[in-house]
């Protein structure tokens, strides 16, 4: 008789990434009998929630339920009904909520309470909503990319699963850029991690890893822009601000109250004789770069070496995967190719920023103007952060790989978070069974 396919013995998991600018829902799937194998979990769906990040719902918490509906309904469709009750749902909130909590624990709690109540209404196994630490965000991002790249697998492969993968088992470093924070995580080479706050020890699949990580709160691309504007207006104190980080001809009115709403601009806060000011773009990469560098305090370092703001950073080691906004921005600018040198990236940024705003709008007619207007700043910020902030050089630039997906799964902290919470990364190397279970009889 003909072989009949048995029902698929698979499991699902859902993670919501509640970021500062938006929320994304990820659905993961894996074979039930291979939970401890490395590389078996893969993403089957990403659903981007329409609207801002959850921290923006402080004044309208009653709208959170509706906000989450579309993506939660999508999860209901994608995951077979028979699996709903055993599918765990986790929500992790990142730097946007860390900043809200810094201002008020009560307001942050209120948002999370409403989020929890909304998610509890679905037929899944809701496991809670929490603000993850910057250290967790960095660590889980590092776990995600190395898991997907097969770096934890003890089996050496003769083939590469992704173009930039080297066949050795050296882990990749992780560079994550969000709207409100940025993380750098990697295994330093025989270097003591001088600051205990930046040290993580993992035992994964029978191997020990001493990992360096730091999350720079307020140095995500959106908060960095607010910082730059607050610094510039503090210096000029004029109602019109000539800004090199925006295209020539670009104009935008900014409310002073919005500028000082975030703890990130606290150090630049001052009483201004006006409630609004106008940004007038002049599109000059070099001046924009110089302005951004003023956000990095490199004059003080209590360690053998630092990134900026007195934060310890060991010498960079190995290859790095740069994902989230590092990837989105560089992809838009068409600068993710391995062949593009740092000098070439800088050259392209100079040209791009100098293009008149009207020309840019015409060239990218399908892109929302709010996002389109900020690519000059964001691209320049990425260069400044990587070169002056993290001390990459023209030579080590080639070790940065701008990654969106690996094997169909998004690079980011969510997969690592789920792998950890579902205990799918064993400390010891699992004993390999002589034969894997077949799904056919």
């Amino acid at each position: 008789t003909q072989n009949k396919a048995l029902p698929e013995n698979v499991k699902y998991g859902i993670v919501l990434d509640a970021g500062s600018s938006h929320t994304s829902l990820y659905i993961y799937k894996w074979p039930a009998e291979k939970e401890n194998d490395t590389g078996v979990v893969h993403q089957v769906e990403e659903c981007r929630v329409k609207g801002p990040g959850i921290s923006k719902f402080v004044q309208k918490v009653n709208e959170i339920g509706i906000y989450l509906t579309d993506c939660m309904e999508r999860a209901r469709e994608v995951i077979p009904r028979s699996q709903h009750q055993e599918t765990p749902v986790y929500l992790g909130a990142t730097a946007g909520m860390r900043l809200l909590r810094m201002e008020s624990e009560e307001l942050a709690d209120r948002v999370l309470d409403v989020v929890e109540r909304s998610l509890s209404n679905y037929p899944f196994d809701f496991q809670g909503a929490r603000i993850i630490t910057g250290q967790e965000e960095g660590a889980y991002g590092w776990i995600t990319i190395n898991y997907l790249l097969g770096k934890f697998s003890q089996k050496t492969r003769w083939f590469s699963i992704v173009p930039y993968e080297t066949n050795n088992q050296e882990t990749f470093g992780a560079l994550d850029l969000g709207g409100a924070s940025t993380q750098v995580t990697f295994v330093p080479q025989n270097q003591t991690i001088e600051s205990p706050d930046n040290a993580l020890q993992f035992r994964l699949y029978g191997k020990d890893y001493n990992v360096y990580t730091h999350s720079f709160l307020c140095y995500g691309k959106d908060q960095a822009l607010w910082q730059k504007l607050a610094k510039d207006i503090q210096v000029s104190s004029a109602e019109s601000l000539a800004d090199p980080c925006f295209h020539p001809g670009y104009k935008k009115v900014v409310n002073v109250s919005d500028l000082y709403k975030t703890p990130c601009t606290k150090r630049f806060e001052m009483t201004l004789p006006f409630q609004q000011f106008e940004i007038q773009g002049i599109g000059n990469y070099q001046q924009c770069h110089q302005s951004i560098l003023e956000l990095f305090n490199t004059s003080y370092c209590p360690y053998s070496q630092c990134a900026f703001n007195g934060i310890f950073l060991p010498p960079l080691q190995g290859d790095f995967g740069a994902f989230s906004a590092f990837y989105f921005v560089m992809k838009f600018l068409n600068l993710t190719s391995e062949k593009v040198s740092q000098e070439k990236v800088t050259e392209m940024m100079k040209k791009f920023c100098a293009q008149p705003w009207e020309e840019i709008k015409t060239s990218y007619a399908g892109v929302k103007e709010k996002y389109l207007s900020e690519y000059c700043f964001s691209g320049t910020y990425i260069l400044s952060l990587l070169l002056q902030g993290y001390h990459f050089t023209a030579d080590s630039w080639e070790h940065i790989h701008f990654i969106g997906k690996i094997q169909g799964s998004d690079a980011g902290w969510t997969l690592g978070y789920m792998l950890n919470l579902t205990n799918m990364i064993p400390a010891e190397q699992p004993l390999s069974t002589p034969l894997s279970h077949s799904t056919y009889v």
């Epitope: 810094m102 009560e106 703890p263 150090r267």
Partner: antibody, heavy 116, light 111 residues
Framework: EVQLQQSGPELVKPGASVKMSCKAS????????MHWVKQSHGRTLEWIGY????????TFNQKFKGRATLTVNTSSRTAYMELRSLTSEDSAAYYC?????????WGQGTLVTVSA | DIVLTQSPASLAVSLGQRATISCRAS??????????MYWFQQKPGQPPNLLIY???NQGSGVPARFRGSGSGTDFSLNIHPMEADDTAMYFC?????????FGGGTKLEIK
């Protein structure tokens, strides 16, 4: 476990300055603001101000502005408060407290005595 | 500045009975659906200890006999049943706006 450890008692002369410290442990130091509170005669509590350890920005009670300075050292996870031009009215216990709007964790206090 | 008026200034309650302390704000301390009102207990030689946050939520490890209520401008702290260990000073505090302010305190004793 969150802990705030404050420096020891101070006996200072009128007109002088005092600088006290508050060392934090058990949490990410830059994720929370640090407030300072004055308590005189074991009864009256007065909020002095707070600092954002993340970037050193601070906000003060107008009553203490210009006379109090708040600073942090993020590598040692320590917040400092300096009070200048002291008078007998400044004799009090001074507390640091972690929080945005919820002062859930307090230091044990630094007792300052201003006396000629 | 928001002025917090606490009453009574002192209170003596029998063991097992109810103690009620009131705190009135000169203007509303509510914002975004949250009451920024807090209650602290302080014993001699110790820092204040958070009992209640957001007007009615119990702080970590706080016994259920401590209850906070109220919104807007009128708040109260109820302790029932009163225990010997509850002898202390009690303060209300608002953090709706800077400068954050405290009530004058209530001294609670055993009758």
């Amino acid at each position: 476990e969150v802990q705030l450890q404050q420096s020891g008692p101070e006996l200072v002369k009128p007109g002088a300055s005092v600088k006290m410290s508050c060392k934090a442990s058990g949490y990410t130091f830059t994720d929370y603001n640090m407030h300072w509170v004055k308590q005189s005669h074991g009864r009256t509590l007065e909020w002095i101000g707070y600092i954002v350890p993340l970037n050193g920005g601070s906000t003060f009670n107008q009553k203490f502005k210009g006379r109090a300075t708040l600073t942090v050292n993020t590598s040692s996870r320590t917040a400092y408060m300096e009070l200048r031009s002291l008078t007998s009215e400044d004799s009090a216990a001074y507390y640091c407290a972690r929080g945005g709007t919820r002062f859930a964790y307090w230091g044990q206090g630094t007792l300052v005595t201003v006396s000629a | 500045d928001i002025v917090l008026t606490q009453s009574p200034a002192s209170l003596a309650v029998s063991l097992g009975q109810r103690a009620t302390i009131s705190c009135r704000a000169s203007e509303s301390v509510d914002n975004f659906g949250v009451s920024f009102m807090y209650w602290f207990q302080q014993k001699p030689g110790q820092p204040p200890n958070l009992l209640i946050y957001g007007a009615s939520n119990q702080g970590s490890g706080v016994p259920a006999r401590f209850r906070g209520s109220g919104s807007g401008t009128d708040f109260s702290l109820n302790i029932h049943p009163m225990e010997a260990d509850d002898t202390a000073m009690y303060f209300c505090q608002q953090t709706k706006e800077v400068p954050y302010t405290f009530g004058g305190g209530t001294k609670l004793e055993i009758k």
